[in-house]
Interface confidence: low
C-alpha cells in the first residue's frame, strides 16, 4: 500500500540586503506570463550562486513571494513585479510561502501545517 | 526513484532523548531544503524544524531548544536530535523534502511510514 504526498504550506518573512548583483535570485510569474496553472503569483526561478539570496540561505526555487517590503505582489504583470524588486531598495523584506512536500503513511490526515508553533 | 526512510523513533520517558534519522536516496539532500514534520494520533500534520540547503536551520517555538536538526552530506542522511522530550512530542515523525522547481510538482507517491515517538 502506497503512502500519499502531502504538502505543508510554510510562509516566511525573509529580509535582504541587496548585493552589487542585486537579490540575487531570478522571478517568473504574472497575470501575463503564469507559472502555475490558474495561478498568477510571482515564483522563484533560480537562485544565483554567492548571490544575496544564496548567502542568506532561505529562499528557495520554487518559493512563491507574496509581498515585497509590505506590498502585496497579486495581480501583476510580470514586468510590473521586476520593476518593483528592482526599486525595492538596499533592505528589502519579503514575505514568501515554502511549500515542503511530505512523506505520509497510508493512513494519513490531511491538515494545516502551523509555523509558528 | 526518490525514497526516504525514517528511523530512531521509539519510547521513551519525559526528559529522555531520541535521535531520528532519515535516509534519502535517488536525491542528494544537501541540495534541497530538507525538514521534519510530525503527526499526533487524529490530528493533521505539523511542521517541526527545516534545514535549507546553506545550513540555516528554522524550528517551531514549542521544540526549539530542545530539538535539533542536521544532516549528514556524505550519508545523505537527515537527522533529528530531540532531548528534554515532553509527552506533547508524541506523534509519528515524517522526512520532509522541500519542492525544487516547479512549485506545485507532485513527485510519484511513494511509500513512507515515518517512525514512531511515545513519551510516557
Known amino acids: 500500500m502506497n503512502g500519499r504526498v502531502d504538502y505543508l504550506v510554510t510562509e516566511e518573512e525573509i529580509n535582504l540586503t541587496r548585493g552589487p548583483s542585486g537579490l540575487g535570485f531570478n522571478i517568473v510569474g504574472g497575470t501575463d506570463q503564469q507559472y502555475v496553472s490558474n495561478d498568477s503569483g510571482i515564483y522563484v526561478s533560480r537562485i544565483k550562486e554567492n548571490g544575496a539570496a544564496a548567502l542568506d540561505g532561505r529562499l528557495q526555487e520554487g518559493d512563491k513571494i507574496l509581498s515585497v517590503n509590505g506590498q502585496d505582489l497579486k495581480n501583476l504583470l510580470h514586468q510590473d513585479a521586476v520593476d518593483l524588486f528592482r526599486n525595492a531598495g538596499y533592505a528589502v523584506s519579503l514575505r514568501v510561502q515554502h511549500r515542503l512536500q511530505v512523506q505520509n503513511g497510508p493512513i494519513g490526515h490531511r491538515g494545516e501545517g502551523d509555523p509558528s508553533g | 526513484h526518490v525514497q526516504l526512510v525514517e528511523s530512531g523513533g521509539g519510547l521513551v520517558q519525559p526528559g529522555g532523548s531520541l535521535r531520528l534519522s532519515c535516509t534519502a536516496s535517488?536525491?542528494?539532500?544537501?541540495?534541497?531544503?530538507m525538514g521534519w514534520v510530525r503527526q499526533a494520533p487524529g490530528k493533521g500534520p505539523e511542521w517541526v524544524a527545516t534545514?535549507?540547503?546553506?545550513?540555516?536551520?528554522h524550528y517551531r517555538n514549542s521544540v526549539k531548544g530542545r530539538f535539533t536538526i542536521s544532516r549528514d552530506n556524505a550519508k545523505n542522511t537527515l537527522h533529528l536530535q530531540m532531548n528534554s522530550l515532553k509527552p506533547e512530542d508524541t506523534a509519528v515523525y515524517y522526512c520532509?523534502?522541500?519542492?525544487?522547481?516547479?512549485?506545485?510538482?507532485?513527485?510519484?507517491?511513494?511509500r513512507g511510514q515515518g517512525t514512531q515517538v511515545t513519551v510516557s
Open positions: 534545514i535549507y540547503y546553506s545550513g540555516v536551520t
Open positions: 535517488g536525491y542528494p539532500i544537501s541540495t534541497y531544503a
Open positions: 520532509a523534502k522541500g519542492v525544487n522547481g516547479t512549485y506545485l510538482r507532485v513527485e510519484a507517491e511513494y
